[in-house]
Interface confidence: medium
């Protein structure tokens, strides 16, 4: 039987012949920034190139004795998880190790920065194939660390990091908080978030996905044939680095944005027990456990989208929150969410030549989140069409009038402090394919996009009685690009996409005295690209 | 994930260069910011990453580092340039007294300075 963690990340079709996916990762070099490693361990011997790089602080304490097996333990285990002969994820991947952590597992931001620069310099001196950089470490939030990661990512390097073992918001740590880095939390064999003593895996919107990180069998530096079981978000990150190496070996031209979207797409959805997370973090934390793609799968034909949450705006009256997509992604829709329900909606804005999603807090509100739907769509061209508040009983509406443009998302923004005090429209028109409909006091923004073969449809789901949550999902073959509440639902907390499902949340109806006239309805915009489907059929 | 609005401490110092005759002195009111780790036990005062503005030329990193050393020496402080960055961010790593931060933040081309801090195996 194979270790539980390898079974968990392996698609069912591999399992018949045990864990023997192709000896993946052979075209990829994985740089490991960690402790020193035991390079002659049988798991990794011949797969690891120990670089000359070393930048570590002195060990603490005058009576500290350097013991090789202790000094090497963390890095050796992770090297084994990435590409170990028996217990590794990407058995064909090559590793290059840089020592940035001392024998006590401690390093510095500056030492790690110098290590990242070393990798960039190596890349310039001798360009190799795809590079994955594994950072199984964490420190406090660091602007310079995050900036360096951003630069390296923009040079075409895939960075994978541990979310952190502090049972805390990963956004408070670096490099976990860097948007360009793939940040990995840890789960166990029961798909529970990992508990580590009194602490455990970090969580929150800065985590991209989770991976196995408890009782992970791997190379032990105690001897060249020893194995040991270890736990932590480092182990989880090593799994994702291995999966990334496999994916990049199969498709070496993948960009970071494409790789991240594929990691999310092939993950197991909604298997983590969210009750472990603090209540206010549950909605922000992705319920995704990493997995390898099915062996033959070249997923290029799919329209991939992911949800990106902003930082919390804070409670001041004019506070705003901004959610941004990655460099190669397109913002196809924008929504907002507030736990108090006091918000003034959201809209798509241009910022530095790129579209961003901005949400607005309202007076007396505890703050808002902006939620961007970020998608990969070749040759896409989007614009926003806005209709000012209509003031009429029919509400405000706007449609995509440009030839060949389809509706991918609807946003609404209002200046009045509380839409609840303004009567909703008497009639609510049915959602029409290329049209957004909103409250008469709100300005409505339609995200209209053109791309080869792009087609979209609007799906509504309304519940006559008040509900705390209404969901509507896109069918197989369609991807959710937009998620918004229908007009007239004044007690709505907001809307957001979870995988391919649109969720509209309302205030707790028992405390709001709501009547059935204030029913909740959700509108999903589901898209697909006939162009991408045709391209994939030609490939096959 | 996190934009540059994380929960870290930021001290904004709007400072002008006191030095006369600096051809490349910052424009009036230009600000450089100082950052340090919000988790106090993880701070490493005495070592700082000085990050220069994005468009700064490669040779400017060494020049700015040398200028900091010269100005510090005139005030009786020893500094040590530990590393000059070229390939990711323009800037340098310097070992110096925290007393010199105000001086360093006034240097031309400086975008921000961050105090070094610890990272840990996870």
């Amino acid at each position: 039987s194979i270790p539980w963690n390898l079974e968990r990340i392996t698609p069912a079709r591999y399992r018949a012949d045990e864990y023997q996916p192709p000896k993946g990762g052979s075209l990829v070099e994985v740089y490991l920034l960690d402790t020193s490693i035991q390079s002659d361990h049988r798991e990794i011997e011949g797969r690891v190139m120990v670089t000359d790089f070393e930048s570590v602080p002195e060990e603490d304490g005058t009576r500290f004795h350097r013991q090789a097996s202790k000094c090497d333990s963390h890095g050796t285990h992770l090297a084994g998880v990435v590409s170990g002969r028996d217990a590794g994820v990407a058995k064909g991947a090559g590793l290059r190790s840089l020592r940035v952590l001392n024998c006590q597992g401690k390093g510095t931001v500056s030492g790690t920065l110098i290590g990242l620069e070393f990798i960039r310099k190596s890349q310039l001196v001798q360009p190799v194939g795809p590079l994955v950089v594994l950072l199984p470490l964490a420190g406090g939030y660091s602007r310079v660390f995050n900036a360096a990661c951003q630069r390296l990512a923009r040079a075409g390097v895939v960075l994978v990091t541990a979310a952190g073992n502090f049972r805390d918001d990963a956004c408070l740590y670096s490099p976990a908080s860097a948007p360009e880095v793939i940040t990995v939390g840890a789960t166990n064999a029961q798909d529970q978030p990992v508990t580590l003593g009194t602490l455990g895996t970090n969580f929150g919107r800065c985590v991209d996905l989770f991976a196995p990180g408890e009782d992970i069998i791997g190379a032990s530096s105690d001897c060249s044939t020893c194995f040991v079981s270890r736990s932590g978000t480092s182990q989880a990150a090593a799994h994702v680095a291995g999966i990334a190496a496999m994916m990049l070996s199969a498709e070496p031209e993948l960009t970071l944005a494409e790789l991240r979207q594929r990691l999310i797409h092939f993950s197991a959805k909604d298997v983590i027990n969210e009750a472990w997370f603090p209540e206010d973090q549950r909605v922000l934390t992705p319920n995704l456990v990493a997995a390898l793609p099915p062996s033959t799968h070249r997923a290029g034909w799919q329209l991939f989208c992911r949800t990106v949450w902003s930082a919390h705006s804070g409670p001041t009256r004019m506070a705003t929150a901004v959610a941004r997509c990655a460099q190669d992604e397109e913002l196809l829709s924008c929504s907002s969410f507030s736990r108090s329900g006091k918000r003034r909606g959201e809209r798509i804005e241009a910022q530095g030549g790129k579209r961003v999603c901005r949400a607005h807090n309202a007076f007396g509100g505890e703050g808002v989140y902006a939620i961007a739907r970020c998608c990969l769509l070749p040759q896409v061209n989007c614009s926003v069409h806005t209709a000012p508040p209509a003031g009429a009983s029919m509400g405000t509406r706007v449609h995509c009038h440009q030839q060949g443009h389809v509706l991918t998302g609807c946003s609404s923004h209002w200046e009045v402090e509380d839409l609840g005090t303004h009567k909703p429209p008497v009639l609510r028109p049915r959602g029409q394919p290329n049209q957004c409909v909103g409250h008469r006091e709100a300005s409505i923004h339609a995200s209209c996009c053109h791309a080869p073969g792009l087609e979209c449809k609007v799906k509504e789901h309304g519940i006559p009685a008040p509900q705390e949550q209404v969901i509507v999902a896109c069918e197989d073959g369609w991807t959710l690009t937009g998620c918004s509440p229908l007009p007239g639902t004044s007690h709505v907390l907001g809307a957001y996409a979870v995988d391919n499902t649109c969720v509209v949340r309302s205030r707790d109806v028992s405390t709001t005295g709501s009547t059935s006239k204030e029913a909740v309805a959700a509108v999903a915009i589901c898209c697909r690209s006939r162009h991408l489907v045709q391209a994939s059929q030609e490939l096959q | 994930q996190e934009d540059e609005d994380g929960d870290y401490e930021e001290l904004v110092l709007a400072l002008r260069s006191e030095e006369d005759g600096l051809a490349d002195a910052p424009e009036h009111g230009a600000t450089a910011t100082f950052h340090r780790c919000a988790k106090d036990p993880w701070r490493l005062p005495g070592t700082y990453v000085v990050v220069l503005k994005e468009e700064t030329h490669r040779s400017q990193s060494e020049r700015t580092a040398r200028r900091l050393q010269a100005q510090a020496a005139r005030r009786g402080y020893l500094t040590k340039i530990l590393h000059v960055f070229h390939h990711l961010l323009p800037g340098f790593l310097v070992k110096m007294s925290g007393d010199l931060l105000e001086l360093a933040l006034k240097l031309p081309h400086v975008d921000y300075i961050e105090e070094d801090s610890s990272v840990f195996a996870q």
């Epitope: 070099e29 190139m49 290059r96 001196v125 190799v128 | 000059v84």
Partner: antibody
Framework: QVQLLESGGGLVQPGGSLRLSCKAS????????FTWVRQAPGKGLEWIGW????????RYNEKFKGKATISRDNSKNTLYLQMNSLRAEDTAVYYC???????????WGQGTLVTVSS | EIVLTQSPATLSLSPGERATITCRAS??????LNWYQQKPGQAPRLLIY???NRATGIPARFSGSGSGTDFTLTISSLEPEDFAVYYC??????????FGGGTKVEIK
């Protein structure tokens, strides 16, 4: 014990070509990076080029582009240097060496002498 | 292209004396500088890597220092077997490997 052993040197006519071999033993060959360096009599060291372990990619000193070709055969644990259009000034001892990423050359062969003369 | 200038070209000293060889790079190279020793009829041997780290098996009398553009190799007390030629070497973008011209340490 890591060892590198060069062979294939000797006397060559001007305009001729030759192939030098470097046999490695003592460690896993396929994950190592190798480089060729030459040294003319009484002169300093001159880098020719290297071959990367990751993807087998090569990189050459501009001076040797088109003249030198580096290759490897992992099954034989052997590195090769093919030199064409040889001239008298190519007379030198040719060394193979292993490089680490940091590009220090930590193991060297004993060298093989190539003499280009008519 | 980076140029490495070693000085002096020749150093005449007696056993037991201290030898100091300098290597100056024409542009900033960080700490990516290595030192080698070569005896007549032998291949070079790695002494110091990354400016200051002794390679495996190298005696403690050999030390390296410097970063940026100026580097020093010091032999604290010359032994008879230390009389040889010493080369510095750096890696950079183009060409990736550059050697200095060498310093001959001879018996006075």
């Amino acid at each position: 014990q890591v060892q590198l052993l060069e062979s294939g040197g000797g006397l060559v006519q001007p305009g001729g070509s030759l192939r030098l071999s470097c046999k490695a033993s003592g460690y896993t060959f396929s994950r190592q990076g190798f480089t060729w360096v030459r040294q003319a009599p009484g002169k300093g060291l001159e880098w020719i080029g290297w071959i990367d372990p990751g993807n087998g990619g090569t990189r050459y000193n501009e001076k040797f582009k088109g003249k030198a070709t580096i290759s490897r055969d992992n099954s034989k644990n052997t590195l090769y240097l093919q030199m064409n259009s040889l001239r008298a000034e190519d007379t030198a001892v040719y060394y193979c060496a292993r490089y680490r990423v940091g590009y220090s050359l930590d193991y060297w062969g004993q060298g093989t002498l190539v003499t280009v003369s008519s | 292209e980076i140029v490495l200038t070693q000085s002096p070209a020749t150093l005449s000293l007696s056993p037991g004396e201290r030898a100091t060889i300098t290597c100056r790079a024409s542009q900033y190279v960080g700490s990516y500088l290595n030192w080698y020793q070569q005896k007549p009829g032998q291949a070079p041997r790695l002494l110091i890597y990354d400016a200051s780290n002794r390679a495996t098996g190298i005696p403690a009398r050999f030390s390296g220092s410097g970063s940026g553009t100026d580097f020093t190799l010091t032999i604290s007390s010359l032994e008879p077997e230390d009389f040889a030629v010493y080369y510095c070497q750096v890696w950079d973008s183009s060409p990736p490997v550059v050697f200095g011209g060498g310093t001959k340490v001879e018996i006075k």
